[in-house]
C-alpha cells in the first residue's frame, strides 16, 4: 500500500506564438482545479477499468480575475498535493491523465459552471520510494508543469511497496539475513515469504510462496525481461540463458506501444494498434469510460455505440459540451419577447414580462382595453403593453375620472391670469402682453409682433386658449 502524490507547479501559456486568452475575466471571475486519473501501465485490465489505480480531485484554487489587456499569466493554483492512495503493489509503470478544470463564479443558481481547459496524458516508469520526478506536458497552447512520486505507507517498503518492515526485536541489529529498512533504520525487513529466488526488484508476493512479476518482467522468479518480439527473430546473437535469439535493435523492441497495444514495424518506423479505449501514437492516451464519471453538472453518461466513442454525455438543460462542462447562456438568444427580462435559473429558463404581456416567452399581448372603460367620453388606447385613456377636454387621470383643472399648471405667461372655461382655459393677459398664453409682448407703438389681432379682440383682451 502507498500513495501517489502529484504536485502542480504551474499552469499557464506555453512557449511560442498564439498565447491563449485568459480563462477568467472581470465579468466572469473563475478558479482552477485539477483531476488526476491513474491506471496501471500495461496491465490487461487497464483498458477496461476506470482509473484502476485511483483518482483524485484537487481543492479549488484562489479566485482569479483577468487584468484587462494583460496576457494570460500562470494562473493561481490550489494549495497542497493531489494524493491517490493505492492498496496493492505499486505497478512500476503507470498511465496518467491530468485534467485542468475552470470553475466560473458568476451568480449561478444551478451551481458553478465547469469547463475543461486542458487534458494531458502519458505513461511513465516510476519506482516507489524514489525522488520527485519533474515533468512538463503541453495541451494546445497551455503548459502544465508538475512533479510526482510514489511513496509506500508503513509497514510497506521497496520499489513496489511489497516488502514489509517490522520494529526491531533486539535493539542492536536485525535478525540473520534481514536488513535494516531504509530510511527507517530502527526497523527491520520482515522475513521474506515469497517463493525462494523471487526477484526482490521485479517480483513481489501477497501470499506466502508466490512470485508475482512487476510489469515488464516475466518468468517463475520474475528475472526475465518481457520481449514482445519472437524468439525466432533472425536478428542478434543467441542467448545462452534462454535459448532464444535476443533481438537486435528494431523499432518494435521493448514494445513502444503502451496499454496493451500491439506493435508492427513499418518501413520507416512502427505502428501501434491500440486496444479499445486507448489512442495516440503509442496508445498512451487513456480512453475514459462512463465508470470514470466524465459527465459534469449532472449529465448522464451512456456507453458509445461504436468502439471509437467510449461514452456520450447527455446534458441537463442549460449545459452543453462533450462533458456537459459548458454552461449555455440561453438568455443570449433573447428568448423573451416584447422586452421581457430573461432569467436563466440553471434548471429552467424564465421570462419576467413587462406589463401587458404574458406567456412563457411573453409572447401574448394582453388586450389592455378589454373590460376597461374610459370615463367622461375618453377613449382607450393600447400601447407598449399598457392601457392608457385619451381623455376628453376638461378631464384627466388614468381613467378620465378626474375633472381637469386647466389652470393648475399656470399656463398664462408674464403674469397673465388664468380662468377655467367649459372648453379649456382662458388667459387674461397683463398690459403689454398678448397671445393665447400671453406669450407675446406688445410693441410700445401699438404694433404687435404678431399679425393684427382677429376682429373683435383688442390687445390686452382675454384670449381663449383653444
Amino acid at each position: 500500500a502507498g500513495v501517489f502524490e502529484l504536485q502542480i507547479h504551474s499552469f499557464g501559456p506555453g512557449p511560442g506564438p498564439g498565447a491563449p486568452r485568459s480563462p477568467c475575466s472581470a465579468r466572469l471571475p473563475c478558479r482552477l482545479f485539477f483531476r488526476v486519473c491513474l491506471k496501471p501501465g500495461l496491465s490487461e485490465e487497464a483498458a477496461e477499468s476506470p482509473c484502476a489505480l485511483g483518482a483524485a480531485l484537487s481543492a479549488r484554487g484562489p479566485v482569479y480575475t483577468e487584468q484587462p489587456g494583460a496576457p494570460a499569466p500562470d494562473l493561481p493554483l490550489p494549495d497542497g498535493l493531489l494524493q491517490v492512495p493505492f492498496r496493492d503493489a505499486w505497478p512500476g509503470t503507470f498511465s496518467f491523465i491530468i485534467e485542468t478544470w475552470r470553475e466560473e463564479l458568476g451568480d449561478q443558481i444551478g451551481g458553478p459552471a465547469w469547463s475543461l481547459l486542458a487534458r494531458v496524458a502519458g505513461r511513465r516508469r516510476l519506482a516507489a520510494g524514489g525522488p520527485w520526478a519533474r515533468d512538463i506536458q503541453r495541451a494546445g497552447a497551455w503548459e502544465l508543469r508538475f512533479s510526482y512520486r510514489a511513496r509506500c505507507e508503513p509497514p510497506a517498503v521497496g520499489t513496489a511497496c511489497t516488502r514489509l518492515c517490522r520494529p526491531r526485536s533486539a535493539p542492536s541489529r536485525c535478525g540473520p539475513g534481514l536488513r535494516p529498512c531504509a530510511p527507517l533504520e530502527d526497523e527491520c525487513e520482515a522475513p521474506l515469504v515469497c517463493r525462494a529466488g523471487c526477484s526482490p526488484e521485479h517480483g513481489f508476493c501477497e501470499q506466502p510462496g508466490e512470485c508475482r512479476c512487476l510489469e515488464g518482467w516475466t518468468g517463475p522468479l520474475c528475472t526475465v525481461p518481457v520481449s514482445t518480439s519472437s524468439c525466432l527473430s533472425p536478428r542478434g546473437p543467441s542467448s545462452a540463458t534462454t535459448g532464444c535469439l535476443v533481438p537486435g535493435p528494431g523499432p518494435c523492441d521493448g514494445n513502444p506501444c503502451a496499454n496493451g497495444g500491439s506493435c508492427s514495424e513499418t518501413p520507416r518506423s512502427f505502428e501501434c494498434t491500440c486496444p479499445r479505449g486507448f489512442y495516440g501514437l503509442r496508445c498512451e492516451v487513456s480512453g475514459v469510460t462512463c465508470a470514470d464519471g466524465p459527465c459534469f453538472n449532472g449529465g448522464l453518461c451512456v456507453g458509445g455505440a461504436d468502439p471509437d466513442s467510449a461514452y456520450i454525455c447527455h446534458c441537463p438543460p442549460g449545459f452543453q459540451g462533450s462533458n456537459c462542462e459548458k454552461r449555455v447562456d440561453r438568455c443570449s438568444l433573447q428568448p423573451c419577447r416584447n422586452g421581457g427580462l430573461c432569467l436563466d435559473l440553471g434548471h429552467a429558463l424564465r421570462c419576467r414580462c413587462r406589463a401587458g404581456f404574458a406567456g412563457p416567452r411573453c409572447e401574448h399581448d394582453l388586450d389592455d382595453c378589454a373590460g376597461r372603460a374610459c370615463a367622461n367620453g375618453g377613449t382607450c388606447v393600447e400601447g407598449g403593453g399598457a392601457h392608457r385613456c385619451s381623455c376628453a377636454l376638461g378631464f384627466g387621470g388614468r381613467d378620465c375620472r378626474e375633472r381637469a383643472d386647466p389652470c393648475a399648471a399656470r399656463p398664462c405667461a408674464h403674469g397673465g391670469r388664468c380662468y377655467a372655461h367649459f372648453s379649456g382655459l382662458v388667459c387674461a393677459c397683463a398690459p403689454g402682453y398678448m397671445g393665447a398664453r400671453c406669450e407675446f409682448p406688445v410693441h410700445p407703438d401699438g404694433a404687435s409682433a404678431l399679425p393684427a389681432a382677429p376682429p373683435g379682440l383688442r390687445p390686452g383682451d382675454p384670449q381663449r386658449y383653444l
Epitope: 482545479f33 483524485a56 465508470a291 464519471g293 459527465c295 449532472g298 434548471h347 412563457p360
Partner: antibody
Amino acid sequence: EVNLEESGGGLVQPGGSMKLSCVASGFAFSNFWMQWVRQSPEKGLEWVAQIRLKSDNYAAHYAESVKGRFTISRDDSKSSVYLQLNNLRAEDTGTYYCTQGNWVGFAYWGQGTLVTVSA
Amino acid sequence: DIVMTQSQKFMSTTIGDRVSITCKASQNVGTTVAWYQQKPGQSPNLLLYSTSNRFTGVPDRFTGSGSGTDFTLTITNMQSEDLADYFCQQYNNYPLTFGGGTKLEIK
C-alpha cells in the same frame, strides 16, 4: 460492473433515529452525484436527497418532507454515501434505495434496505 | 412541486401487443422526463431519459414521446419479460418527482 449495496435498515419507533449506508463499486465514486430514493405502497417512489461532489462543496438537496430531519453525506475514500434519519415518522416507512445520481435520470440502483417506523 | 400523474394504475395486455403508457405533468417540463421499469421484487431500472432516449441495453421496442406536459412510453411487440411497473419522473426542477406508476398485466 456498477454495484450499490445498502444497509442499516430495520424497525424503529416513531421519533427514533437510524443511519443508512450505501457502499459503491465499479465506478469512480467521487465523480458522481449520489441520491436516496424511497418507495412505499402508499406513496410510491419518492426522491429523498441528493449529494453532489467535493468540488461542489458536497452540496445537498432534500425533499421538503424530510428537510431538517434527514442528512445525506458521503465518504469518497470509502466509496460510500450515508443517510442519517432523525425524528422518524410512520410515513417514513419504506424501502430506501441508493442511486448513482445525476440530473438526467438515475442510472443505477441498489437493492434497497427496508425502514419500518412503528410503535 | 411538479406533480406527475399516471392516470392508469393497471393496464391489461397480451404478448405481441402494442402498449402505450401515459404520464401528465402539472406544468411544462419540456422534455426532461425519464421512464423506469420495476419488476416484482427488484429495484427500478432506467429505461428512457430526455423523453425518448434509450438507456444502455434497453431494447428498441421501448420508445418514448411527448413534450411539455404530456408524455407516452410505448412498448411495441410486448414480451412476457416486460410485465412490470412503469414510472415516469421529471427532472425539470427540484424536488424531483415520480408518477404513481402503471402496472402491466396479462389479460
